[in-house]
């Protein structure tokens, strides 16, 4: 007798790993024999799809090699024309052992920055990710966290964070380990012991010490008055990432000696500097109330203006007087590019001699101000038009910067050459040519490239750094 189909083994949920076999069974009793069709997520599975095996008149559906995308609801429908069609459904849950899809890579990072070691995983159930440093599980702390993605984030990287890391992805089906990667922490060059200034007698020997550290270990170079040290012997030793350099000098003139520690981070370099002065006792005896010291000018901007080997006053109210004063002239120098050919050399001479004042070595190194007459010559003769324009702008408050730019000297406050010819400095460039009183000897101007540090406001009585002047 005809019998409507009955599914005697309803479909069950099937768990399968990727690449495994998964079989659904839909045993049907009926007469005549039913036609059985299969769907996945309500889409008909075609009999000729070679990824599937349909056996026993459609009662067994096998996925021969499960893929991620096979996850879903599978239904069998049996129909033999007697009564209605019957259906049974079951889920295929594709399980997956943990797999690390984006493993960590070796990282070089500078101390203090944030490091992220990637570890992206796949798996079902979703794997939990932990990290191993060296041979021990890594404990999370205020700086270290395992992100939702599995990546390891380390804030404010410290030297002790360096080491070997690997991530571990784990679920109920298994565990996957990444390869071991290295976190290298690099540290900017830093001076541990700066050279000390010395006041010695002419012809003495002096040893300057400079100790620096960093990762990688920095190299130390010595600079004497702006140039590489030409004489003297250097001895170096390295121990436990600390480099110690000793420069031995035979002193015949005063000088500024700078120790520069440099190390490389990829394509970039980090440097640390420390300077010491070596003065000769007869030239200047440092006192408590010193405002600065005498040293040879070794900048670039005023090379053409100042006399060769000029002894200039370096104002110690700046952390790095040479660099600070050089920056002052450099910044103002750029503004002089647009002034008239008559004004420019005079203004440059005034600028350089005002910032790098001639220095009188003695018991207390003293700056020698520019003679009032020379200042007035620039103001009223060479640069009258520009000076007026600049004063107008100053009154309108157009110059606000307290840093980096030089104020115009107040000519009236400068000493006159008629009072004491030795109390003020002359500007040789402004001495009149008898044939043409408004000509100057030819001058070269150059724009050196200067690194711009953060400058402190000057507390010097010799010159101030407010408000700006421009001769345009």
């Amino acid at each position: 007798l005809p019998k409507a189909p009955v599914i005697t083994t309803p479909l069950e949920t099937v768990d399968a790993l990727v690449e495994e076999v998964a079989t659904f069974m839909c045993a049907v009793e009926s007469y005549p024999q039913p036609e059985i069709s299969w769907t996945r997520n309500k889409i008909l599975i075609k009999l000729f799809d070679t990824r599937y095996s349909i056996r026993e008149n459609g009662q067994l559906l096998t996925i021969l090699s499960v893929e991620d995308s096979d996850d879903g609801i599978y239904c069998c429908t049996a129909n033999n024309g007697v009564g209605g069609a019957v259906e049974s459904c079951g889920a295929l849950q594709v399980k997956m052992k943990p797999k690390i899809t984006r493993p960590p890579i070796n990282v070089k990072i500078i101390e203090g920055l944030k490091a992220v070691l990637p570890c992206t995983t796949m798996g079902n159930p979703k794997p939990s990710v932990s990290w191993i440093k060296g041979d021990s599980p890594l404990r999370e702390n205020s700086r270290t966290a395992v992100l939702e993605s599995g990546s390891l984030r380390i804030h404010n990287v410290q030297k002790e964070d360096a080491g070997q890391y690997r991530c571990v992805a784990k679920n109920s089906l298994g565990t996957a380990y990444s390869k071991v990667v290295k976190l290298e922490v690099e540290v900017f060059a830093r001076i541990l012991r700066a050279p000390e200034s010395h006041n010695v007698t002419f012809g003495s020997f002096v040893t300057l010490h400079c100790t620096a550290t960093g990762i990688p270990v920095p190299t130390i170079t010595w600079i004497e008055n702006g140039n590489a040290v030409s004489s003297g012997s250097i001895q170096e030793s390295v121990k436990d990432r600390v480099i110690d350099s000793r420069l031995q000098l035979f002193i015949t003139k005063p000088g500024l000696y700078t120790c520069i520690a440099t190390n490389k981070h990829g394509e970039k370099f980090s440097t640390a500097k420390a300077a010491a002065t070596v003065s000769i006792a007869e030239w200047s005896k440092p006192q408590k109330d010193n405002k600065g010291y005498c040293a040879q000018y070794r900048g670039e901007v005023c090379n053409a203006v100042l006399a060769k080997d000029a002894l200039v006053f370096l104002n110690t109210s700046y952390a790095d007087p040479e660099e600070a004063q050089e920056l002052l002239v450099h910044t103002a120098w750029n503004e002089l590019k647009v002034v008239s050919p008559l004004c420019r050399p005079a203004a440059e001479a005034l600028l350089c001699n005002h910032v790098f004042q001639e220095c009188s070595p003695g018991v207390v190194p003293t700056p020698i101000p520019i003679c009032r007459e020379y200042c007035l010559a620039v103001k009223e003769l060479f640069c009258a038009k520009e000076w007026l324009a600049m004063e107008e702008k100053t009154h309108r408050g157009l110059y606000r910067s307290e840093m980096h730019l030089l104020s115009v000297p107040e000519c009236s406050k400068l000493p006159s050459m008629h009072w004491d010819p030795t109390a003020c400095a002359r500007l040789p460039h402004l001495d009149y040519n008898k044939e043409n009183p408004k000509t100057f000897p030819p001058m070269t101007s150059s724009k050196p490239s200067v690194d711009i540090p953060n400058l402190p406001s000057s507390s010097s009585s010799s010159f101030s750094v407010s408000p700006t002047y421009s001769m345009t």
Epitope: T9, V14, A16, L17, T23, M25, S53, E56, L60, L64
Partner: antibody, heavy 121, light 107 residues
Amino acid sequence: EVQLVESGGGLVKPGGSLRLSCAASGFTFSSYTMDWVRQAPGKGLEWVSSIGSNGDYIYYADSVRGRFTISRDNAKNSLYLQMNSLRAEDTAVYYCARGQLAVAGTHFDYWGQGTLVTVSS
Amino acid sequence: DIQMTQSPSSLSASVGDRVTITCRASQKVNKYVNWYQQKPGKAPKLLIYAASTLQSGVPSRFSGSGSGTDFTLTISSLQPEDFATYYCQQSYSPLSTFGQGTKLEIK
């Protein structure tokens, strides 16, 4: 009574061919999946091949795929195994078995007595 | 392919003993596991199908259990006629596979 009788075994040289037959009786042959299973001397059972009740699907073990061919003639109640490119490791007793669908997959509820195939030079 | 691993490969026991043979599948095979008995020179004989269903005509001292990957065949009280080789088989995949066999010998 269900009966399965194999024939066609014998001695054959490596590279040679042989055709095994299995005559079925006592049941509706056309309603069952049929399989071949072999057993090398002193070894365990090894499934060889399977064919659906109306020949709609065929499966082979990796070790014989491309060399053996399973077929059936429902009109004659017969199952066949054509064996080509025979190798020494094909030496075994070959059984035909009936596949029965149950609540969880199929099982071999009836077996023939087997036929010995010897591949040797 | 799905591998079926039987243990032990051989076993000595006495009449009346309780014996357990295990079979492990290389992946989950639901309950699609069958057990066969084979005596020397004879064809295999079906004992248990669908992991735990006793085939008609097989003594009740034979029982099967398991699901997923781990299966067992138990003989509750060994009889002299039970000394033979036992095989598990999976039919979850259309590419069926057998375990390597467990030879049960008289102690």
